[in-house]
């Protein structure tokens, strides 16, 4: 499973509003939804290998 909570900033432009914690921006419907509804990477314990290396999250990502 690659689902799990991740606090992402909102993607609803032109003036992006941050999603609240535990919500993620759904690019396909253009609004914030519960992160568990999207297949986002589950944060791993320190030292655990990740299925895909992720760049640091950028603002509004």
């Amino acid at each position: 499973m690659r689902r799990g909570p991740r606090s992402l900033r909102g993607r609803d432009a032109p003036a992006p509003t941050p999603c609240v914690p535990a919500e993620c921006f759904d690019l396909l419907v253009a609004h914030c939804v519960a992160c568990g509804l999207l297949r986002t990477p589950r944060p791993k314990p320190a030292g655990a290998s990740s299925p895909a290396p992720r760049t640091a999250l950028q603002p509004q990502e």
């Epitope: 993607r11 509804l37 999207l38 990477p41 950028q58």
Partner: antibody, heavy 118, light 113 residues
Framework: DVQLQESGPSLVKPSQTLSLTCSVT????????WNWIRKFPGNKLEYMGY???????YYNPSLKSRISITRDTSKNQFYLQLLSVTTEDTATYYC????????????WGAGTLVTVSS | DIVMTQTPLSLPVSLGDQASISCRSS???????????LHWYLQKPGQSPKLLIY???NRFSGVPDRFSGSGSGTDFTLKISRVEAEDLGVYFC??????????FGSGTKLEIK
């Protein structure tokens, strides 16, 4: 690991309905977007549509009203139906899962070749 | 829909050579959030497509560093610094900025010269 597997008939007659199943293991289809993509002879990839975590659907307008994507959450499967097929629908059909952070297709089925011929 | 134009359609190379594939989009792929959702996939013979590069320049897990992606706006490039036999196949660019529908380039077949 998430795995997807397409199944269904490899030969369909013109004017009939193409029906495929995508079986998902390692993740729940009640999370994310689950997609159908096809590849024509000659390498063209066409995005067909999705069914979402909520059960909402999107269909590529190029397929008009011929396409239907449904799901059975109890079986963790989703389905493609393409009505009134012609030889132009001969293609390899893939189901794929969508990463919800960077929005790429991170997991694909092996694909199934469907030939439309009488 | 966004049209993705890939060149060349066929790319004959010698092993060890550098290869370069271009992808151009009919509109800028910079999303209003500032991100550019341009990805590259490789489909090896008999396999399904596999992600190589996401968001223009980020290598996916397990992808060798001889693969690199660059570009911005509407013009993007995938480079392979030293082609190996296992790199042969069809390369596709794809955009997830203006979706749905997701759209793909026409594909570039990398083959041995």
């Amino acid at each position: 690991d998430v795995q997807l597997q397409e199944s269904g008939p490899s030969l369909v007659k013109p004017s009939q309905t193409l029906s495929l199943t995508c079986s998902v293991t390692g993740d729940s289809i009640t999370s994310g977007y689950w997609n159908w993509i096809r590849k024509f002879p000659g390498n063209k990839l066409e995005y067909m549509g999705y069914i979402s975590y909520s059960g909402s659907t999107y269909y590529n307008p190029s397929l008009k009203s011929r396409i239907s994507i449904t799901r059975d959450t109890s079986k963790n499967q989703f389905y493609l139906q393409l009505l009134s097929v012609t030889t132009e629908d001969t293609a390899t059909y893939y189901c794929a899962g969508l990463d919800g952070l960077y929005w790429y297709f991170d997991v694909w089925g092996a694909g199934t070749l469907v030939t439309v011929s009488s | 829909d966004i049209v993705m134009t890939q060149t060349p359609l066929s790319l004959p190379v010698s092993l060890g050579d550098q290869a370069s594939i271009s992808c151009r989009s009919s509109q800028s792929l910079v999303h209003s959030n500032g991100n550019t959702y341009l990805h590259w996939y490789l489909q090896k013979p008999g396999q399904s497509p596999k992600l190589l590069i996401y968001k223009v320049s980020n290598r996916f897990s397990g992808v060798p560093d001889r693969f690199s992606g660059s570009g911005s706006g509407t013009d993007f490039t995938l480079k392979i610094s030293r082609v190996e036999a296992e790199d042969l196949g069809v390369y596709f660019c794809s955009q997830s900025t203006h979706v749905p529908p997701f759209t793909f380039g026409s594909g570039t077949k990398l083959e041995i010269k």
